[in-house]
Interface confidence: medium
């Protein structure tokens, strides 16, 4: 049994880091493998993660961590029974993938403005809480070419757009994702999408 693709890990910079790797053949990850992780810190204890299958030869492990700080560094060992298959390290602050925003809501009752709001996925005491910026994706269910991205570079988790920038009388969907420039993170996963019917009053023509 050998590791084909070494583990790569990303952290949500809160409580979970996710490591993925590939073996050289079909593997029952949960029965055959264990991923050991230990914070390089005074008197820290090692922890065991039981991986799950992620495709035939792929494995994924969700490492539970206490509140992460930028200096944290973990040793990682991948074991198959008594055999050490791979040894490495992981610094969560250098491999951050933020949590996806939640509770995306489209408010259509604000005159002819669409107000999209969502929730910051971090609690106020987490460093990322005040460092997230967002991308909002809006698309038409009827017209694949009607697909747009709005970058929200301010901290408030909301976006206002004129309803008239979208076509009237058809259904749209929206979703949002986050990233943090401070840690040069990757983008989060997209939030679940939300759907609404876009309708607005055409302005009277002026003669």
């Amino acid at each position: 049994m050998k590791v084909l693709q070494e583990p790569t890990c990303v952290s949500d910079y809160m409580s979970i880091s996710t490591c993925e790797w590939k073996m050289n053949g079909p593997t029952n990850c949960s029965t055959e493998l264990r991923l050991l992780y230990q914070l390089v810190f005074l008197l820290s204890e090692a922890h065991t993660c039981i991986p799950e299958n992620n495709g035939g030869a792929g494995c994924v492990c969700h490492l539970l961590m206490d509140d992460v700080v930028s200096a944290d560094n973990y040793t990682l060992d991948l074991w198959a029974g008594q055999q050490l298959l791979w040894k490495g390290s992981f610094k969560p602050s250098e491999h951050v993938k933020p949590r996806a925003p939640g509770n995306l809501t489209v408010h259509t009752n604000v005159s002819d403005t669409l107000l999209l709001t969502w929730s910051n996925p971090y609690p106020p005491d987490n460093y990322l809480y005040n460092h997230l910026t967002y991308a909002v994706n809006i698309w038409s269910e009827n017209d694949p070419a009607d697909f747009r991205i709005y970058n929200v570079t301010y901290l408030e988790p909301s976006l206002r757009i004129a309803a008239s920038t979208l076509k009237s009388g058809i259904s749209y969907r929206a979703r949002v994702r986050a990233w943090a420039q401070c840690y040069n993170t990757t983008w989060s996963e997209w939030s679940p999408s939300t759907k609404w019917h876009n309708s607005y009053r055409e302005p009277f023509e002026q003669h």
């Epitope: 230990q38 390089v40 005074l42 008197l43 204890e45 090692a46 065991t48 074991w79």
Partner: antibody, heavy 117, light 107 residues
Framework: EVMLVESGGGLVKPGGSLKLSCAAS????????MSWVRQTPEKRLEWVAI????????YYPDSVKGRFTISRDNAKNTLYLQMSSLRSEDTALYFC??????????WGTGTTVTVSS | DIQMTQSSSSFSVSLGDRVTITCKAS??????LAWYQQKPGNAPRLLIS???SLETGVPSRFSGSGSGRDYTLIITSLQTEDVATYYC?????????FGGGTKLEIK
């Protein structure tokens, strides 16, 4: 060269107190956790106190908790162990040791503590 | 607490011998194990960490092996200066604990 030199050992009666010191040199003292490890007359090793580099965190095994206090003076590069309510089973050779997270990478030569009436 | 058992408290060896010192833990350590050498009248010295990683300055005749609960310190060709007591220490669970030691004596 890393050097750790203990002092302060001696003969003390049960229930008595003693304060050990350890002078450190050859490394950036404040960057390392430090510890006291004792060796019993039967030659068994047991750590009895650990302190973080900044001195803000301390750790003790149940056998000495509430009786021993570890401290450090980073300005003087010195580690201390205040021992009180001493018992005969505390009789040992006490080593000052530098801690590399989980194991002890440098040790002093030790100072002897004898608890006897 | 994790119990660390060094089955031989002492044994006699000859110079040039291949010496194997064993250490057994009461639970799986996943290689979180260190070995120390203590010469008579001296402080312990760290030889090996992570069950197999030799510390800087330690002669290459020393090596560590093992996994799970069973670990071994090997001296391939015993020298006079290797006469000492050897201790294992686990750092899998706090409180970290030491084995009782194995003393090498020359026949």
């Amino acid at each position: 060269e890393v050097m750790l030199v203990e002092s302060g050992g001696g003969l003390v009666k049960p229930g008595g107190s003693l304060k050990l010191s350890c002078a450190a040199s050859g490394f950036t003292f404040s960057s390392y956790a430090m510890s006291w490890v004792r060796q019993t007359p039967e030659k068994r090793l047991e750590w009895v106190a650990i302190i973080s580099g900044g001195g803000d965190s301390t750790y003790y095994p149940d056998s000495v908790k509430g009786r021993f206090t570890i401290s450090r003076d980073n300005a003087k590069n010195t580690l201390y162990l205040q021992m009180s309510s001493l018992r005969s089973e505390d009789t040992a050779l006490y080593f000052c040791a530098r801690l590399h997270y989980w194991y002890f990478d440098f040790w002093g030569t030790g100072t002897t503590v004898t608890v006897s009436s | 607490d994790i119990q660390m058992t060094q089955s031989s408290s002492s044994f006699s060896v000859s110079l040039g011998d291949r010496v194997t010192i064993t250490c057994k833990a009461s639970e799986d350590l996943y290689n979180r194990l260190a070995w120390y050498q203590q010469k008579p009248g001296n402080a312990p010295r760290l030889l090996i960490s992570g069950a197999t990683s030799l510390e800087t300055g330690v002669p290459s005749r020393f090596s560590g092996s093992g996994s799970g609960r069973d670990y071994t310190l090997i001296i391939t060709s015993l020298q006079t200066e290797d006469v000492a007591t050897y201790y294992c220490q686990q750092y899998w669970r706090n409180p970290y604990t030491f084995g009782g030691g194995t003393k090498l004596e020359i026949k």
